[in-house]
């Protein structure tokens, strides 16, 4: 009779993570008598996957009933496959021996490859806010995928970005892989509502890429522009001065009025108005009793925005000249200057 052969008909098997792998093996003869064992890998370090004779292998089931006398099908199923299960599996026939069974013949091996989906991309922005015209870096990470081939793209508001660097780790063999990418984004004043998107495409996703997003509202700081103006006279000897704080983001803002360098009032932006681009406007006013001042008054609107160094604008009230006419005329503007004179 022809010598027993162990046949593993599949050179390779490709299985998605979480699914069941079927590893096929048949023997061409019932002789010699002895059990079958399955191993992952070859040589002295091989890992026992299934032993027909003894042991507990909760993830492994046999395709046919190995207790039947004439059975020659030794195929197995391995459940809940993970990337860590990848490798070459050998079906090995043992001959009954005393005291131990003796390895008789091995199949040619079946390489199990596992397809695993990448994790949802995680996008991280800079730790500190940055102002328009600055370049900031965003990182995108995804883990646990197999095979290694993967495509990563960056978008800002739907427009693909080109300034980024991507690495897949490791560069050689592994049961699964990780991807890391860093993109550079130039901020503009209109970016409060902008989004940065990292898109990952992989064979396991069947054309439906995974996306991670970051809102630039968490990254950008738009500093305010200040304008100090004098309003028409409200009552005799009283002047209303306003400080327009425009186009700032985020909302955290504190304003201090100074009269000749002395703090007059401090307030925190509360009832702001929102612009279409997501920035905010706010106005503060100060009522100045001109008659209480002998000399010219220097009014300063000082704004501290989002913990940054204060910015300020000043306005000069002339109170010494022509006091009798004070309040009768509107302010004369010097174009390009924030000085206002009362005659």
């Amino acid at each position: 009779e022809e010598e027993l052969q162990v046949i593993q008909p599949d050179k390779s098997v490709l299985v998605a993570a979480g699914e069941t792998a079927t590893l096929r093996c048949t023997a061409t003869s019932l002789i010699p008598v002895g059990p079958i064992q399955w191993f992952r890998g070859a040589g002295p370090g091989r890992e026992l996957i299934y032993n027909q004779k003894e042991g507990h292998f909760p993830r492994v089931t046999t395709v046919s009933d190995l207790t039947k006398r004439n059975n020659m099908d030794f195929s197995i199923r391995i459940g809940n496959i993970t990337p860590a299960d990848a490798g070459t599996y050998y079906c090995v026939k043992f001959r009954k021996g005393s005291p131990d069974d003796v390895e008789f013949k091995s199949g040619a091996g079946t390489e199990l490859s596992v397809r695993a989906k990448p994790s949802a991309p995680v996008v991280s922005g800079p730790a500190a806010r940055a102002t328009p015209q600055h370049t900031v870096s965003f990182t995108c990470e995804s883990h646990g995928f197999s095979p290694r081939d993967i495509t990563l793209k960056w978008f800002k508001n739907g427009n693909e970005l080109s300034d980024f660097q991507t690495n897949v780790d490791p560069v050689g063999e592994s049961v699964s892989y990780s991807i890391h990418s860093t993109a550079k984004v130039v901020l503009t004043r209109e970016d409060v509502h902008s989004q940065v998107i990292c898109e990952v495409a992989h064979v396991t996703l069947q054309g439906d890429p995974l996306r991670g997003t970051a809102n630039l509202s968490e990254t950008i700081r738009v500093p305010p522009t200040l304008e100090v103006t004098q309003q028409p006279v409200r009552a005799e000897n009283q002047v209303n001065v306003t400080c327009q704080v425009r186009k700032f983001y985020p909302q955290r803002l504190q304003l201090t009025w100074l009269e000749n360098g002395n703090v007059s009032r401090t307030e925190t932006a509360s009832t702001v108005t929102e612009n279409k681009d997501g920035t905010y406007n706010w106005m503060s006013w100060l009522l100045v009793n001109v008659s209480a001042h002998r000399d010219d008054v220097k009014l300063t609107c000082q704004v501290e925005h989002d913990g940054q160094p204060a910015v300020s604008k000043s306005h000069d009230l002339k109170v010494s000249a022509h006091p009798k006419e004070q309040g009768s005329n509107t302010a004369a503007e010097n174009t390009g200057s924030n000085e206002r004179n009362i005659y």
């Epitope: 994790s119 990470e141 883990h143 690495n167 490791p170 560069v171 050689g172 049961v175 890391h180 860093t182």
Partner: antibody, heavy 121, light 113 residues
């Protein structure tokens, strides 16, 4: 400056578990993967695995997949490794070491001083 | 897994001498896309933790004296110390970071005569 401060030596009984810590300072904790390496007395180095502190993702040397559990706490910038079902084979010094995952995948550039684990009944 | 083999396992040299040690990998560590070799060298002095000397097979880590030089490509790598100092007494390990699991060589112990 960069520092990886590891917890002190431990004596444990066979079958028990131990959890060691690695406190990172002097750099952005989430910008580096934290690797763990085993060194048995008078022996060479053996890579256990790593954790990405920013996502919590872990990757193990298959040899240690049932032995070591890696975790990280971003708020305290500390990485942890728990070893379970201890045997005499687990008696070793365990190092944490950081690795830049940025524009280039470098090797492990800073190492902790190591935590010595002795397993004895 | 990639097997890393170092030789010799130990060597004794006098201060001022040049020393070379070898590291071989069971498969190439050269990544064709960026032409980099994913190999590092570490120095471990008695009672201390390992210290990175060389990465990318030949790039010296900042602060490492220029008497340490890494060379080689593919599967054969060398660490050279041009003029040994007494403070170089240590075990030197090579490590591949080309594939997971990362693997180390068995080390070369440098002793001073």
């Amino acid at each position: 400056q960069v520092q990886l401060q590891q917890s002190g030596a431990e004596l444990a009984k066979p079958g028990a578990s131990v959890k060691m810590s690695c406190k990172a300072s002097g750099y952005t904790f989430t910008s580096y993967w934290m690797h763990w390496v085993k060194q048995r007395p008078g022996q060479g180095l053996e890579w256990i695995g790593y954790i990405d502190p920013s996502t919590g993702y872990t990757f193990h040397n298959q040899k240690f997949k049932d032995k070591a559990t890696l975790t990280a706490d971003k708020s305290s910038t500390t990485a942890y490794m728990q070893l379970r079902s201890l045997t005499s084979e687990d008696s070793a010094v365990y190092y944490c070491a950081r690795r830049d995952y940025g524009s280039s995948f470098y090797a492990m550039d800073y190492w902790g001083h190591g935590t010595s684990i002795t397993v004895s009944s | 897994d990639i097997v890393m083999s170092q030789s010799p396992s130990s060597l004794a040299v006098s201060v001022g001498e040049k020393v070379t040690m070898s590291c071989k990998s069971s498969q190439s560590l050269l990544y064709s896309t960026n032409q980099k070799n994913y190999l590092a060298w570490y120095q471990q002095k008695p009672g201390q933790s390992p210290k990175l000397l060389i990465y990318w097979a030949s790039t010296r880590e900042s602060g490492v004296p220029d008497r340490f030089t890494g060379s080689g490509s593919g599967t054969d790598f060398t660490l050279t110390i041009s003029s040994v100092k007494a403070e170089d007494l240590a075990v030197y390990y090579c490590q591949q970071y080309y594939s997971y699991p990362w693997t180390f060589g068995g080390g070369t112990k440098l002793e001073i005569k």
